[in-house]
């Protein structure tokens, strides 16, 4: 059939990507799996413009993104280069803080209440955002 050019139902289109915003919280790994089960990935922020778009939709709520350093260096889940890419950390973050008493440091990144990023314990049940590129999302009919 002809290629569709719209996002699945309940997803929001923006700049050739589709975004889905959760209403509940999950640990980072479950949020990651949730997005993968939707043939998507946790949101990868590549520009200030995309940062503002996501921030507008999530509001002042801790929300996971697709950035982690569970295996050493910081990595985006889709392979986007971290070192040369967009960053929006809070001052003095990431700090891999061990003082939370939950064991280990902080290996997963999230949007904070002001939109800037913080690293936190990956087991915390935060909301999350899934993202998929529009050409991938349109390979199948939208969810009905």
């Amino acid at each position: 059939g002809s290629e569709r050019t719209c996002c699945p139902v309940n997803w929001v289109e923006h700049e050739r990507s589709c975004y889905w915003f959760s209403r509940s919280g999950k640990a980072w790994a479950d949020a990651d799996n949730y997005c993968r089960l939707e043939d998507a990935h946790l949101v990868v922020v590549t520009s200030w413009e995309e940062q503002k778009f996501v921030q507008h939709h999530i509001g002042p709520v801790n929300t996971w993104m697709g950035l982690h350093d569970q295996n050493g260096p910081w990595k985006w889940v889709d392979g986007t280069d971290y070192e040369t890419g967009f960053k929006n950390w809070r001052p003095e973050q990431p700090d891999d803080w061990y003082g939370h008493g939950l064991g280990g440091g902080e290996d997963c990144a999230h949007f904070t209440d002001d939109g800037r990023w913080n690293d936190d314990v990956c087991q915390r049940p935060y909301r999350w955002v899934c993202e998929t590129e529009l050409d991938k999302a349109s390979q199948e009919p939208p969810l009905l």
Epitope: N10, R23, S24, E38, D39, K136, E140, L143, L144
Partner: antibody, heavy 123, light 107 residues
């Protein structure tokens, strides 16, 4: 009516391979994630594997990781489970189970199940 | 993985009895839990989703309750066709996990 029909089970020697199929009808197959769940004789249910609706992501129980491969052909409305390096403990009835449209509450949920196909691993 | 503790593992009851089965989880799963009925040689059939919502076509004598870590399936008045094995499934956290099952037998 939603229907799932498994096939491909049988008797196989340890170390051997089998490919299970699950033919789906009565719903828009490519809108749903799909799962395989197994049940050893006289035992409970064990989730085995899942696949996203377009097949881009796959998930496996630790007990089968590296030996089993889940796949799907949306043009044929069919789900597959390729089982390699089979062991005696893989002996079970294998069910395919339909996922649900994903909202927060339906992560890895399963609503409709097929009747199952029996896999026996024995020498 | 989330551990599912289902109890009792078996029970004997008579037609007309009220039967209660419990599923406890090792961590909070909100209400992301389903209940299934399985008869010998048959596929599991979902009775309850989202902990307390009745699946379409399932008799109203079945009900589910609970949230967090403790969940209950109740059959208000057991019928002959209800003698079967019942399982809970949590789908809040990966991997999805089932309870060990409860076999409901005729007394």
């Amino acid at each position: 009516e939603v229907q799932l029909l498994e096939s491909g089970g049988g008797l196989v020697q340890p170390g051997g391979s089998l490919r299970l199929s699950c033919a789906a009808s009565g719903f828009t197959f490519n809108n749903y994630a799909m799962n395989w769940v197994r049940q050893a004789p006289g035992k409970g249910l064990e989730w085995v594997s899942a696949i996203s609706r377009r097949g881009g992501s796959t998930f496996y129980a630790d007990s089968v990781k590296g030996r089993f491969t889940i796949s799907r052909d949306n043009s044929k409305n069919t789900l597959y489970l390729q089982m390699n390096s089979l062991r005696a403990e893989d002996t079970a009835v294998y069910y395919c189970a339909k996922g649900e449209l994903l909202e927060d509450y339906y992560y890895f949920a399963m609503d409709v199940w097929g009747q199952g196909t029996t896999v026996t691993v024995s020498s | 993985d989330i551990q599912m503790t289902q109890s009792p593992s078996s029970l004997s009851a008579s037609v007309g009895d009220r039967v209660t089965i419990t599923c406890r989880t090792s961590q909070d799963i909100r209400n992301d839990l389903g209940w299934y009925q399985q008869k010998p040689g048959k596929a599991p059939k979902r009775l309850i989703f989202a902990a307390s919502s009745l699946q379409s076509g399932v008799p109203s004598r079945f009900s589910g309750s609970g949230s967090g870590t403790e969940f209950t399936l109740t059959v208000s008045s057991l019928q002959p066709e209800d003698f079967a094995t019942y399982y809970c499934l949590q789908h809040n956290s990966y991997p999805p996990t089932f309870g060990g099952g409860t076999k409901v037998e005729i007394k």
